[in-house]
């Protein structure tokens, strides 16, 4: 779970060890704050749950890529 210390800075201290299906993901944001001990990605699921993930993992990069493409392609 993300942890907000001195809001609005949110940091991740642990990453999920489970790969999440892209169908369950709604959006993401990158955590690159100099106040945080680790670079991270926070995925928001379709049920609004936030999950910390390791940006170095391929499934995380692929999921961000997928979400980026969804954002670029307007739904008709």
């Amino acid at each position: 779970q993300p942890d907000a210390i001195n809001a609005p800075v949110t940091c991740c201290y642990n990453f999920t060890n489970r790969k999440i299906s892209v169908q369950r993901l709604a959006s993401y944001r990158r955590i690159t704050s100099s106040k945080c001990p680790k670079e991270a990605v926070i995925f928001k699921t379709i049920v609004a749950k936030e999950i910390c993930a390791d940006p170095k993992q391929k499934w995380v990069q692929d999921s961000m890529d997928h979400l980026d493409k969804q954002t670029q392609t307007p739904k008709t």
């Epitope: 800075v9 990158r30 690159t32 704050s33 100099s34 106040k35 945080c36 001990p37 680790k38 670079e39 940006p55 170095k56 990069q61 961000m64 890529d65 980026d68 493409k69 954002t71 670029q72």
Partner: antibody, heavy 121, light 109 residues
């Protein structure tokens, strides 16, 4: 006003070592930023070397710089870059740069004028 | 890695210049910065977050793009715009290699 000044650039022999210092004024590292070293060889482009969090000291390096270059926060207003096993290819102007705020994605809005490192026998 | 095109471009005063920056993998839609550098000077931040103008920068500079393709457009070019322009990824700090593009030299005639 906010300012960065690099010092320590010099003529050094191959395999030599050198420490560069970046001194900040007009702001304090207690406000968190990414402080980075960027170099530029004569007539070439910009190359990121390493970055350090001004508040908690987390460091990141370019893969080629790991082991040979060390970035450190030495006081509340200074960041250093220790360079070892220098080669002719390390000849460049070395800039100190600071991000606009604590996030990496906001770019470097503050730069020093640079300090020249020349590696030659 | 960030690839910039063209390496050099000539433009007349009042013209428009378009510089492209391509990322080797998607960096999202708000993780790119642009800089202007003149000889003997450090770079100057023009745009961050892909399209946000840095403080004091003319609105003649416009950034756009997302995913892997990004563009800097300079309209109503002035002599003072003669410089080298660099893009920089702001998506990940844990991979600093080739964070900057190779640069584009803009020559104003």
């Amino acid at each position: 006003q906010e300012q960065l000044v690099e010092s320590g650039g010099d003529l050094v022999k191959p395999e030599g070592s050198l420490t560069l210092t970046c001194t900040a004024s007009g702001f304090s590292f207690s406000t968190s930023y990414w402080m980075c070293w960027v170099r530029q060889a004569p007539g070439k482009g910009l190359e990121l070397i390493a970055c350090i969090s001004s508040s908690i000291g987390v460091t990141y390096y370019a893969s080629w710089a790991e082991g040979r270059f060390t970035i450190s926060k030495t006081s509340s207003t200074t960041v250093t870059l220790q360079m070892t096993s220098l080669t002719v290819a390390d000849t460049a102007t070395y800039f100190c740069a600071r991000t606009t705020d604590d996030n990496w994605n906001v770019g470097f809005n503050l730069w020093g004028p640079g300090t020249l490192v020349t590696v030659s026998s | 890695d960030m690839t910039q095109t063209p390496a050099s471009v000539e433009v007349g005063v009042g013209g428009t210049v378009t510089i492209k920056c391509q990322a080797s993998q998607s960096i999202g839609n708000r993780y790119l910065s642009w800089y202007q550098q003149k000889p003997g000077q450090p770079p100057k931040l023009l745009i961050y977050g892909t399209s946000t103008l840095a403080s004091g920068v003319s609105s003649r500079f416009k950034g756009s793009g997302s995913g892997t393709q990004f563009t800097l457009t300079i309209s109503g070019v002035e002599c003072a715009d003669s410089a080298t322009y660099y893009c920089q990824q702001g998506a990940t700090i844990s991979y600093l290699d080739n964070a900057f593009g190779g640069g584009t030299e803009v020559v104003v005639k």
